[in-house]
C-alpha cells in the first residue's frame, strides 16, 4: 500500500495521504451532486469488511460513462492489489441488493471517515 | 431549525452512573452524526465520543470504559451514559452536530449544555 | 493523541483593531481545522471549518488559514461582540482534540 494514489506526485503517497484524498474526493462528489448521481445508476451493495477496496471497484467499473466517480475508480485500484475487471464479483457483494450510487458513494465515504479517524489505513 | 437540547440530572453521587440525553429537531439523525463534548469549570473542551448516522458509535479512548453512546431515531434523541463517576468528572455536558459532508468532524450546532455537579 | 497548542493565552484590543490566534499541531492535520467562539455561560459557537471555510452567518472580518501543522484566526476591525474565548480544534484524527483557549477582551 505504499505506491497508493500517485496522481498529484510523482514518488510514492503513504497510505494515510491516499485514504484522505480518496474521503475528499467522496466528498467532492456528495457535495457537488446537483442531478442524480450517474443518471441514478444501480450497483451492488458491498460488505464493507477487509477487502472492501476491491469490491467497491468491481461494483462501481461497472458504472460507465460517468464523468463524475472516474477519479474515485481510478484511486481505488490503487487500494485493490489485483487488476479489476467490469462483470468481475467477488464474495463481498451483497448480491441481492442494488443501491444508487449515491448511496453507494455515502456509505463508502461514512465507512472510510471512521477508519481514517481511527487511524486504520491498510 | 436545527436545535439540539440535553437534558439529565444536575447533581449525582460519587461512583454513579450519569445518564444524559439529547433531543434534536431541524435534522434526522440518519443524515447526521452527534458528538458529545464536555467542559469542566473555567477549563476547556474535552470531546467524548461520537454517535455516527449509521448507528455506530466511537469514543475517547481515556473514557472508552466508563462511556456508552445509544439513540432512538424514532424520538430524534441520543443518550449517553458514563459510570463510575468521580469529582473531575464535573462538567457541562454537551451535545452537537457534526458537520458531516466534509472530511473532517466539526460542531455545526451545539446545544445549550447541561451542568453536571458530582458530589455526595 | 494530537495536542493543539494555541497562543496567546489572553489578549486585549481595541476598537477596529486586528488581532491574530496562533494554534500549533502536534502533528500533520493538512487543513482539518475548525475554530469556535464562546462566550461566557454560553455554549461555543462554529466560526471558521477546514481551516478556511467561514461558517454561513458569521462576519467576514473573521478569517483563517494555515495547513499541516500551523494555523492562525485573524479578527479585522474588532467589535465589542467579539469578546470570548476562542478555541482551535482539529477534526483529523481520534480522539479529537480542543486549544486550550484564548480570552479576547476589549481594551
Known amino acids: 500500500l505504499t505506491c497508493l494514489g500517485g496522481f498529484a506526485s510523482p514518488g510514492p503517497v503513504p497510505p494515510s495521504t491516499a485514504l484522505r484524498e480518496l474521503i475528499e474526493e467522496l466528498v467532492n462528489i456528495t457535495q457537488n451532486q446537483k442531478a442524480p448521481l450517474c443518471n441514478g445508476s444501480m450497483v451492488w451493495s458491498i460488505n464493507l469488511t477487509a477487502g472492501m477496496y476491491c469490491a467497491a471497484l468491481e461494483s462501481l467499473i461497472n458504472v460507465s460513462g460517468c464523468s463524475a466517480i472516474e477519479k474515485t475508480q481510478r484511486m481505488l485500484s490503487g487500494f485493490c492489489p489485483h487488476k479489476v475487471s467490469a462483470g468481475q464479483f467477488s464474495s463481498l457483494h451483497v448480491r441481492d441488493t442494488k443501491i444508487e450510487v449515491a448511496q453507494f458513494v455515502k456509505d463508502l465515504l461514512l465507512h472510510l471517515k471512521k477508519l481514517f479517524r481511527e487511524g486504520q489505513f491498510n | 431549525q436545527v436545535q439540539l437540547k440535553e437534558s439529565g440530572p444536575g447533581l449525582v453521587q460519587p461512583s454513579q452512573t450519569l445518564s444524559l440525553t439529547c433531543t434534536v429537531s431541524?435534522?434526522?439523525?440518519?443524515?447526521?452524526?452527534v458528538q458529545w463534548v464536555r467542559q469542566p469549570p473555567g477549563k476547556g473542551l474535552e470531546w467524548m465520543g461520537v454517535m455516527w448516522s449509521d448507528g455506530d458509535t466511537s469514543f475517547n479512548s481515556v473514557l472508552k470504559s466508563r462511556l456508552s453512546i445509544s439513540r432512538d431515531t424514532s424520538k430524534s434523541q441520543v443518550f449517553l451514559k458514563m459510570s463510575s463517576l468521580q469529582t473531575e468528572d464535573t462538567a457541562t455536558y454537551y451535545c452537537?452536530?457534526?458537520?458531516?459532508?466534509?472530511?473532517?468532524?466539526?460542531?455545526?450546532?451545539w446545544g445549550q449544555g447541561v451542568m453536571v455537579t458530582v458530589s455526595s | 493523541d494530537i495536542q493543539m497548542t494555541q497562543s496567546p493565552h489572553s489578549l486585549s484590543a481595541s476598537l477596529g483593531e486586528t488581532v491574530s490566534i496562533e494554534c500549533l499541531a502536534s502533528e500533520d492535520i493538512s487543513n482539518y481545522l475548525a475554530w469556535y467562539q464562546q462566550k461566557p455561560g454560553k455554549s461555543p459557537q462554529l466560526l471558521i471549518y477546514h481551516t478556511s471555510r467561514l461558517q454561513d452567518g458569521v462576519p467576514s472580518r473573521f478569517s483563517g488559514s494555515g495547513s499541516g501543522t500551523q494555523f492562525s484566526l485573524k479578527i479585522s476591525n474588532m467589535q465589542p461582540e467579539d469578546e470570548g474565548v476562542y478555541y482551535c480544534?482539529?477534526?483529523?484524527?481520534?480522539?479529537?482534540?480542543f486549544g486550550s483557549g484564548t480570552k479576547l477582551e476589549l481594551k
Open positions: 480544534q482539529q477534526g483529523y484524527r481520534f480522539p479529537l482534540t
Open positions: 452537537a452536530r457534526d458537520g458531516t459532508i466534509a472530511a473532517m468532524d466539526y460542531f455545526d450546532y
Open positions: 431541524g435534522f434526522s439523525l440518519t443524515n447526521y452524526h
